[in-house]
């Protein structure tokens, strides 16, 4: 099974080596999740032609996937550490329902899908410890998530393939933006 960063032998602190700082641990965690997403996308691309679809064609969807915008304070122009951290955590919490949807979408990469989901939960916990303004973080309503999940699972096969591809691509771009921003903090 895929291991979380810090669980494999490479990450065990060698004698006299410095333990990872909170920021380094978060950085490493995001890179680990991105590796997992990339592995999942390989399976998706091998079984459907979604990866060849243009970004514009894929944009014609009803998914409300989290995305970084200028107002979120994560871009260098208008950078705001507190606002940005809230956006990253809120976005990750919003992605959780979509990561749950992915759990039954993979055959050979089932464990990888689980690892991405679990390490995202751990990442959220790390970031919540770092955040000062926890009150500003809105958690999605469980009932809303449940009905969204039901709706996504009721789609036909082609739409489910499209949804899977879109979730993975959007999650990748959200994490890349988050990593760039976190390295400025």
């Amino acid at each position: 099974a895929p291991v979380l960063p810090g669980e494999d032998s490479k990450d065990v602190a060698a004698p006299h080596s410095q333990p990872l700082t909170s920021s380094e641990r978060i950085d490493k965690h995001i890179r680990y999740i991105l590796d997992g997403i990339s592995a999942l996308r390989k399976e998706t691309c091998n079984r459907s032609n979604m990866c060849e679809s243009s970004k514009e064609a894929l944009a014609e969807n009803n998914l409300n996937l989290p995305k970084m915008a200028e107002k979120d304070g994560c871009f260098q122009s208008g950078f705001n550490e507190d606002t940005c951290l809230v956006k990253i955590i809120t976005g990750l919490l919003e992605f959780e329902v979509y990561l749950e949807y992915l759990q039954n979408r993979f055959e050979s990469s089932e464990e990888q899908a689980r690892a991405v989901q679990m390490s995202t939960k751990v990442l959220i916990q790390f970031l919540q410890k770092k955040a000062k303004n926890l009150d500003a973080i809105t958690t999605p309503e469980p009932t809303t998530n449940a009905s969204l999940l039901t709706k996504l699972q009721a789609q036909n096969q082609w739409l489910q393939d499209m949804t899977t591809h879109l979730i993975l691509r959007s999650f990748k771009e959200f994490l890349q933006s988050s990593l760039r921003a976190l390295r400025q903090m």
Epitope: R31, L34, S38, C51, K55, K172, Q176, R180
Partner: antibody, heavy 127, light 111 residues
Framework: EVQLQESGPGLVKPSQTLSLTCTVS??????????WSWIRQPPGKGLEWMGV???????YYKPSLKSRTSISRDTSKNQFSLQLSSVTPEDTAVYYC???????????????????WGKGTLVTVSS | QAVLTQPPSMSGTLGKTLTISCNGT?????????VSWYQQLPGTTPKLLIE???TRVSGIPDRFSGSKSDNTASLTISGLQSEDEATYYC??????????FGGGTHLTVLG
Amino acid sequence: EVQLQESGPGLVKPSQTLSLTCTVSGGSIATSYYAWSWIRQPPGKGLEWMGVIDYDGDTYYKPSLKSRTSISRDTSKNQFSLQLSSVTPEDTAVYYCARAGLGDSYYLGTYYAMDYWGKGTLVTVSS
Amino acid sequence: QAVLTQPPSMSGTLGKTLTISCNGTSSDIGSGNYVSWYQQLPGTTPKLLIEGVTTRVSGIPDRFSGSKSDNTASLTISGLQSEDEATYYCASYRETNNVVFGGGTHLTVLG
């Protein structure tokens, strides 16, 4: 040693689509976290980044060229391609393909450093 | 019209030190350590010298060094040699998922 070679017609008529292919040797475009870029240079002018296709097959384009540009890849042939539609004489340039993605570029989505380049191919847009 | 601003031409003396500047904004050069520098000798392909603002690429002599302050990046060439006569380009990642080049600086090395 990674080598890149551009190929395609040297002359394209205005309003037509310019199509170029970059063949990569000495390394697979489907392995490691590299991305593959297109850059052009009009005669006597500077370099202009056009777009990139990353390890996952995701594409990103220069905003002002986005509506006319398409980059795709064929991993079985170890090639990636550029299509530029509705060309005008202003699109006359030497077109380069290049490899990008040193360091943490994949994780950050920052493909600004191109370490291996093709020799370039001159494309003239003229009737 | 290049997004990053470089002086179009500069000249330096053999053996001396010269610095080429590259001015951008908080959306590109200021957005992180995502700056590279290229050397293009007449009639040849651009060659990567520096990536990540300061990291010299393998095989590039330590006479070449890169730095950054706020929205301005710099390439410094010390101990100028005649073979350094070329056009130098800076490039940077630009938010979001974009790359921009400078207009290029043609360097002439004087005896």
